[in-house]
Interface confidence: low
């Protein structure tokens, strides 16, 4: 179920699948819950440790049963990835935090008039992750109003330090706030050149698009299907991004899909879930459980229940099947992706619905003149 | 709201309009989504309109000059006002609106979370209301969604300030000492969100008060914490399945 | 540092039309009401004209209704008043004026700019 | 319309001098109003606001009072940089100046 209640002073023991700096405990959980494998959660305020690079320390991590010790520490904020918490599922994050400078690569720089139109010129450009602003009270007079655009290879500050008279945020383009406008079209039998960011297996490139969408550097992607003519290719998703922030060229091949991250959509951006299953497609995986369920909707509600599992396979074999139920088959892998994808089999695949933000659970933890 | 300021997209993605079409149609109440299928507001708002046909819903919208008729709206399916609503008086203001059609959630429209039952002991410093309401008390109806910082009083000093009106324990009361920040007329229905641990929460809905944003005077809303026994029982049985999980 | 600048002031014949601009530097433009106000030679003070922050609402002084519209562009942190059929008794200097807090009851004017002539003269 | 009436139009008075100025306003504006002083060729500076708030950076002989309909601006003792016009205004519905009081030496 979903669990929203955060630990004070409390620290969870083991389990690290991964560390950023990020400036407060929620922005860690969001990075938790859009984590393929992240369950659990600790953060490290600047005040609750003198160790200079474990300040603003999140750290995300992965327990088999779900839970993992907690240990007391002053000033430390822990709690649980939003995973199952439907529409409290958001990459959106609109806080401004004063007295902090989140630091990454500066690729613009320009004078504003405030941190807010700071943050709007973020959300406005196509590579800005995060920035920082000087105020007007600033010790340099120099720097005074200076709007800082920022991006890092993880999406999240490559440091983070506490330096007054600075304002920082994140921009709000997960908000569908941008007024850059998107590009919805899928473009047939045509791949996109430039550099990869990351590389992933998906069924279609419409799940390829949303893990774009969703990936910190991805501005476009390019698809190869299932009959692309080099079979270790067959499937690939490849994220990629640009110095321009569009595709520098493209090439006319058979058999490739490509498009653009839809995260620069205004007012609507897709569920950061894939809900479709795929008939005659094994997903290979790390086999988490294996359970006798009654068709393929019902194990894609039981993986969307077990809180780590990302993929499915429902085997309708003969030797997989009791009566009416057959074998559902519960996986998960590092990146949330199936680590090989099989046509022609019997059965279905899917992906768990945890992540998607429109499901019912969604719980809430923890005379005069009438107007 | 006097003394807010303009929202923006996506702020308040729980907040929506209730206008009513007759000849004209004009926006009249605010009230919250906390469901798919759920909006809460204030009882009075149906005072001499509780015809259900004549009301239209806006969720995820900022502006109002922005509709047209062609801007999509919820009809509603069934208005639950608390039974013991007395017209008359201001006590147990709310009411439920069943939707005809369950709404999607997006960033810019999903339900705002409801507290615990009973909820006392939570020290809620960081509370706001919205609302398209008055900007004074002679005022109109604002275009942009207005949203105000206001802090929340004991219940003791709003009686203070209320001599002639019992503030029972039901109702919760924010404002300024000085004055200068309330809801008004228009914002009725909506929301007071308190956010604690990260999360934003209904704490009250806006209901009355003296005049909006006089001295000494603060908003009078309604308790939502004190309600969620009835807001369950109400969702629940309306059609055999939990719409909402109550807090654990 | 907060700054208004008026410019387009001049002289016109009556019948005609000008168009004013107000420059604002120094502050969130998009988050406050502006105004306009004229003072005729050797007069007092007379508010012309507001516009809320987001352009959606405007008022007018009923000596200018019809006649002036004004208007906002946020993402150039400019204020404008089209002034058509103009006359004689618009002659002044026209200010352009914001209150600080935002608030819109606290709206008394603690910004000013330093003003530009329009003269309606034949 | 809001009407706003000041008296009187001009006041001559000498430097150390308490002057006071009256603002009449045609309907109650509660307290919804300000006052401003302005040099010959300058633009207005708000010097009171909400009737009695003295703005950031005014001095304390300013001082202001009143509510509904009649307003005052008090001097407490005239210094030489307060000769000016001085002008009442109310924002209770939209916003209405005074004709404003002209404060020259005796």
């Known amino acids: 179920g979903c669990l929203t209640q955060l630990y004070e002073n409390a620290f969870f023991r083991g389990g690290d699948v991964a560390s950023m700096y990020t400036p407060n405990a929620q922005y860690c959980q969001m990075r938790c819950t859009f984590h393929p494998r992240c369950l659990l959660f600790s953060f490290l305020p600047a005040s609750s440790i003198n160790d200079m690079e474990k300040r603003f320390g999140c750290f995300l991590k992965d327990s088999v049963t779900g839970t993992l010790p907690k240990v007391h520490r002053t000033g430390a904020v822990s709690g649980h990835s939003l995973k199952q918490c439907g529409h409290q599922i958001s990459a959106c994050h609109r806080d401004i935090y004063k007295g902090v400078d989140m630091r990454g690569v500066n690729f613009n720089v320009s004078k504003v008039s405030s941190v807010e139109e700071c943050q709007k010129r973020c959300t406005s450009n196509i590579r800005c992750q995060f920035f920082s602003y000087a105020t007007q009270t600033f010790h340099k007079a120099e720097y005074r109003n200076n709007c800082l655009l920022k991006y890092s290879p993880g999406g999240t500050p490559t440091a983070i330090k506490v330096l007054s008279n600075v304002e920082s945020g994140f921009s709000l383009k997960p908000c569908a706030l941008s007024e850059i406008g998107c590009h919805m079209n899928i473009f047939q039998h045509l791949a996109f050149s430039d550099v990869d960011v990351a590389r992933v297996l998906t069924p279609d490139a419409f799940v390829c698009r949303t893990i774009c969408t969703y990936h910190p550097n991805c501005l476009f992607f390019t698809f190869y299907t299932n009959v692309w003519k080099i079979e270790s290719q067959r499937n690939v998703c490849l994220l990629k991004t640009s110095e321009s922030g569009t595709p520098s060229s493209s090439t006319p091949q058979e058999n490739t899909i490509s498009g653009y991250s839809l995260l620069t959509c205004k007012r609507t951006l897709p569920e950061p879930c894939h809900s479709k299953i795929y008939p005659g497609v094994d997903f290979g995986g790390e086999e988490l459980n294996v359970t006798f369920v009654k068709g393929v909707n019902v194990c894609q509600e039981t993986c969307t229940k077990m809180i780590r599992c990302q993929f499915f396979t429902y085997s309708l074999l003969p030797e997989d099947c009791k009566e009416e139920k057959c074998k559902c088959f519960l996986r998960l892998s590092m990146d949330g992706s199936p680590t090989r994808i099989a046509y022609g089999t019997q059965g279905s695949s899917g992906y768990s619905l945890r992540l998607c933000n429109t499901g019912d659970n969604s719980v809430c933890t923890t005379k005069t003149s009438t107007r | 709201i006097v003394g807010g300021t303009n929202s923006s997209w996506g702020e308040w993605p729980w907040q929506v309009s209730l206008q009513v079409k007759l000849t004209a149609q004009r926006h009249l109440c605010g009230g919250s989504l906390i469901g798919h299928q759920w909006v809460l507001t204030a009882a009075h708002c149906f005072d001499g309109l509780p015809l259900q046909d004549v009301w239209r819903i806006y969720s995820g919208i900022l502006n109002l000059s922005d509709i047209t008729k062609d801007t999509p709206f919820s009809q509603i399916k069934e208005i639950i006002i608390h039974q013991n609503y007395k017209v008359s008086e201001g006590n147990h203001d709310i009411a439920l609106i069943k939707l005809q059609a369950p709404l999607n959630y997006t960033e810019f429209q999903k339900p705002i979370c409801l507290p615990s039952k009973g909820d006392t002991s939570t020290i809620y410093t960081n509370c706001w209301v919205t609302g398209w309401g008055f900007s004074k008390e002679k005022g109109e109806i604002q275009n942009i969604l207005q949203k105000v910082n206001i802090p929340l009083v004991t219940n003791e000093e709003c009686q203070k300030r209320y001599q002639d009106y019992k503030i029972t324990q039901r109702m919760v009361c924010a404002g300024y000492k000085e004055g200068g920040k309330d809801a008004c007329k228009g914002d009725s229905g909506g929301p007071l969100v308190c956010k604690h641990n990260g999360m934003w929460r209904l704490v009250g809905i806006t209901s009355w008060g003296e005049g909006c944003a006089r001295r000494e005077q603060p908003g009078v809303y309604t308790k939502v914490a004190e309600y969620m026994d009835w807001i369950l029982e109400k969702t629940q049985s309306s059609d055999g399945k939990a719409q909402m999980q109550s807090p654990a | 540092e907060v700054q208004l600048l008026e410019s387009g002031g001049g002289l016109v014949q009556p019948g005609g039309s000008l168009r004013l601009s107000c420059a604002a530097s120094?502050?969130?433009?998009?988050?406050?009401?502006m105004m306009w106000v004229r003072q005729a030679p050797g007069k007092g003070l007379e508010w012309v004209s507001g516009?809320?922050?987001?352009?959606?609402?405007?008022v007018y002084a009923d000596s200018v209704k019809g006649r002036f519209t004004i208007s906002r562009d946020n993402s150039k942190n400019t204020l404008y008043l089209q002034m058509n059929s103009l006359r004689a008794e618009d002659t002044a200097v026209y200010y352009c004026?914001?209150?600080?807090?935002?608030?819109?009851?606290?709206?008394?004017?603690?910004?000013w700019g330093q003003g530009t002539m329009v003269t309606v003269s034949s | 319309d809001i009407q706003m009436t000041q008296s009187p139009s001009t006041l001559s008075a000498s430097v150390g001098d308490r002057v006071t100025i009256t603002c009449r306003a045609s309907?109650?504006?509660?307290?919804?109003l300000a006052w401003y002083q302005q040099k010959p060729g300058k633009a207005p500076n708000l010097l009171i606001y909400?009737?009695?708030t003295l703005e950031s950076g005014v001095p304390s002989r300013f001082s202001g009072s009143g509510s509904g309909t009649e307003f005052t601006l008090t001097i407490s003792s005239l210094q030489p940089d307060d000769f000016a016009t001085y002008y009442c205004?109310?924002?209770?519905?939209?916003?209405?100046f005074g004709q404003g009081t002209k404060v020259e030496i005796k």
């Open positions: 004026a914001y209150r600080r807090t935002g608030a819109p009851r606290r709206d008394a004017f603690d910004i």
């Open positions: 120094g502050f969130t433009f998009s988050h406050y009401i």
């Open positions: 516009i809320y922050s987001s352009g959606g609402i405007t």
């Open positions: 309907q109650s504006i509660s307290s919804w």
């Open positions: 909400k009737a009695s």
């Open positions: 205004q109310q924002y209770n519905t939209y916003w209405t």
